[in-house]
Each structure stands twice: as structure tokens, then as C-alpha cells.
């Protein structure tokens, strides 16, 4: 039950994360005009990965696409690439994880196959989240660099009589959406990987539990605490039988094949 919940939650969290990555990629407000310490302009500039926009105080907003590939900064191209890779990986991960969900039955698919698919989608989500975080962080770094460069220009280029309004850009809403979305996708991916461990049939643990079942002297120790089997912690030895989760002790109360030897 816990495995199904972890897998389901991982899927939902990743789904929200990828939706956020798509939203961030499409948003126009990656960088917005810095209004602090600036004369109050009647136009507000903001830029996205695909177009730049100007909102006039009149109420009119004009957006212009970047209709060039070669003329764009390499960093912007890199950010675009990272975000697209993140979206593609995330979309594939979602597709894989749908079939991997324990609550969905597809023919006679074995648990091992579902476990592999869960792990695959988990890794895809992790990489997708990292791509988004990296893309947003690269853009943010680019903004910080440009911000301080334009600030320096502001104070050095004031020798003449005529002043020029230097437009500086700061973090836009899309950056925060991207960071959060990337983080959610990453968390979702980790949850899927954790769920995969619970889905995979652990042969050694099963045998270990069965083997110790005949040794009634080691089933309980004075004081009432459970004895360890020697194969990792007790939590790892929680197995699923007949569709229900049972502890080591519960398993021992059922006849095992070794009891009749």
C-alpha cells in the first residue's frame, strides 16, 4: 500500500512539476524591467525565451518574437535547449510512469517490469528536473551578470548633458516557476525511484524470512522487541503477501513450506 502511495504521489508531483516546466518555458516574464532606482517610465519591458514584450501605460502591449536563430546569444539557446530537453524527458517519463503505476493493470505485466519502468521514469523525472533547474539557473546567472554590467554603465556614461534611461532587467516570474517546477519534478523522480525499490521482488529477503520461520526460539526475545534476521533492518524485510503488507512476525504465524520438512 505504501509503495502504491509513494508511486502515485511521485507521479502526481512529477506531473505538476512538468506542467510547471512547460508553463515556465512558454512564459514571457523570464526577465522583467527593474523598476528600482529608475525614473518612472510609462513603458514596462519584459522578456521570455521566445519573444520580448513592452507594456505601455496606455494599456497596449506589444510582443515581438525572436525571428532569428543565429543572432541570439548562445546562453539563451542553451537555456532553450535545456528546457526543451527537460520537457521531452518529462513527457516520456510521464508516459512510461502511467504504465508503471501499480494501480493500473495492463495484461499480465509482472511486478519486475513495473519496477523497471518505475525506475526508468524516476530517472527521467530527475534528469528533467535537473535540466529545468539548470536552465533557469543559467538564465538567472546571465541576468545577474548583465544587471551589474548595466549598473556600471549607468554610473560611467553620465558625463554628457543628455541622460539615457538604461533599462536593467531583473528576475521574472518564470524563473521562480521554473525553479519550483524543476524541484517538484526532481522530488517526484526520487519518489518514483524509492517506489521502485518496494516494487522489485527481493528474492534474498523472502528466503531469509522463510528460513528463520522454523526457528521459533529466535522469533521473539524477552522484553518483547523483534529480533533481527541479519539481512538489513526490519523495515527492509516488510514483504507483501496475498496483496497485504505484513511484518516478519505476521509472516511467521502462517505455515511455511519449511515447517513441514
Amino acid at each position: 500500500m505504501a509503495v502504491t502511495a509513494c508511486q502515485g504521489l511521485g507521479f502526481v508531483v512529477s506531473l505538476i512539476g512538468i506542467a510547471g516546466i512547460i508553463a515556465a518555458t512558454c512564459m514571457d516574464q523570464w526577465s522583467t524591467q527593474d523598476l528600482y532606482n529608475n525614473p518612472v517610465t510609462a513603458v514596462f519591458n519584459y522578456q521570455g525565451l521566445w519573444r520580448s514584450c513592452v507594456r505601455e501605460s496606455s494599456g497596449f502591449t506589444e510582443c515581438r518574437g525572436y525571428f532569428t536563430l543565429l543572432g541570439l546569444p548562445a546562453m539563451l539557446q542553451a537555456v532553450r535547449a535545456l528546457m526543451i530537453v527537460g520537457i521531452v524527458l518529462g513527457a516520456i517519463g510521464l508516459l512510461v510512469s502511467i504504465f508503471a503505476l501499480k494501480c493500473i493493470r495492463i495484461g499480465s505485466m509482472e511486478d519486475s517490469a513495473k519496477a523497471n519502468m518505475t525506475l526508468t521514469s524516476g530517472i527521467m523525472f530527475i534528469v528533467s528536473g535537473l535540466c529545468a533547474i539548470a536552465g533557469v539557473s543559467v538564465f538567472a546567472n546571465m541576468l545577474v551578470t548583465n544587471f551589474w554590467m548595466s549598473t556600471a554603465n549607468m554610473y560611467t556614461g553620465m558625463g554628457g548633458m543628455v541622460q539615457t534611461v538604461q533599462t536593467r532587467y531583473t528576475f521574472g516570474a518564470a524563473l521562480f516557476v521554473g525553479w519550483v517546477a524543476g524541484g517538484l519534478t526532481l522530488i517526484g523522480g526520487v519518489m518514483m525511484c524509492i517506489a521502485c525499490r518496494g516494487l522489485a521482488p527481493e528474492e534474498t529477503n523472502y528466503k531469509a524470512v522463510s528460513y528463520h520461520a522454523s526457528g521459533h526460539s529466535v522469533a521473539y526475545k524477552p522484553g518483547g522487541f523483534k529480533a533481527s534476521t541479519g539481512f538489513g533492518s526490519n523495515t527492509k524485510n516488510k514483504k507483501i503477501y496475498d496483496g497485504g503488507a505484513r511484518t516478519e512476525d505476521e509472516v511467521q504465524s502462517y505455515p511455511s513450506k519449511h515447517d513441514y520438512v
Epitope: 510609462a42 513603458v43 519591458n45 494599456g59 541622460q163 539615457t164
Partner: antibody, heavy 118, light 113 residues
Amino acid sequence: QVQLQQSGAELARPGASVKLSCKASGYTFTVWSMSWVKQRTGQGLQWIGEIYPKSGNTHYNEKFKGKATLTADKSSSTVYMQLSSLTSEDSAVYFCARAYYGNSFAYWGQGTLVTVPA
Amino acid sequence: DIVMTQSPSPLTVTAGEKATMSCKSSQSLLNSGNQRNYLTWYQQKPGQPPKLLIYWASTRESGVPDRFTGSGSGTDFSLTISSVQAEDLAVYYCQNDFIYPFTFGSGTKLEIK
């Protein structure tokens, strides 16, 4: 077509207040901002401030802060400007003007003459 | 506040001649975001409200005769009337539409000989 109909001429005594109106028609009232412009007889134009009918947000020229108050009524598509503590310096023609591309004013009211005797 | 300086005033020309008036701003009106200059030209005839001629420094408003041309960038702008007609007798104002408060020039009065 876009039309801005302003209220009639006002004669006010010094220290009093007047409220001028500008009724808009022929376009979606909440889409464009509305400005008020002052013109004293034989003189140039002075921008007073602007209001966004959608939100009610305003921008004022510092020179007119405390003197002019802009409001908008979406239900009647009307913008108002209240002028307070009137002096002879406030005697002028006041225009309402609807914003357009480039923050320019493409549509103007016919103007309201406010007279404050010295 | 941005100071808009217009010259000459008055501007006297013969009908059919070219008239050019200048407008200088104390700060650049160029917006780097869209590379547009936020300067507007108006024509005002006696007893009438101003009429929009040119916005974004060079974009002619629809219905305005093509003899009116706006040009310039940054801080220096001009309005040219290629062939002055009798009905062009008016005061011409330039306006800063970029930085609050919006400011107008003192106007150039066009007179016909």
C-alpha cells in the same frame, strides 16, 4: 466611433471644488487609460494625470497632486476629475484624452472651461 | 521632469513650401525594449482640442495626410510638412510619452506668408 463627452463649463469661487466628468463611448472602456490635460488661455498643454478604468490605478503629475483627484465609474463608462481648493491659477480649459499606441492621445474631449475669479 | 524644447516659434512659410520644426528632449525617449522612441506630435487649431499626427516619433496616425513626416531618435526630433497648405495653420506640440510626468513642448506656431 470613439467619443468623449465632457461636462459643461464651471464657474467656481476661490477655495471651492469642482468635479468634471468625461463620458466615453465607442470602445471598451476598461482597455485604455484616460488622461486629463490642462490648457490655460493662450498657453501650452500640461498633463495632469491618468487613470486605468479597469483597476482604478492612477498616475499623477507631482504638480497636481493634492489638487486633482481622478476616479472612474465602469458602469457608466465615465471618468471624473475633482479639482479642490480652487484659485485663479486653476482657471483653464481641461481636456480628457484617451490613450492610444505609444502612450499618445488619439481621442480628446471637447474641453471644459473652468473659471475661478481672482 | 523631462524638458521638451521646441523651435522655432513662430515658423513662417509660404504655402506650398516645406516646413520643418524641431523638438529636443532633456532625456532620451528611446525605449531599448522595442527600439521605439516615445515622442508624439499634435496639431492644435484655435478653439479645438489637439489632434494626434505622429506617434512613436515617426508613425503617422491614420487619416493624417502623408505630407506630415516625423523623424529623429533619442533626444532630437523633427516634424516636416512637405508642402504647407492653408489648413495647416496651427500650433504644433511635441510630447514626451516615455517618462512620467508626460511633458509637452511649448509649441511651434506655424504661420503662412
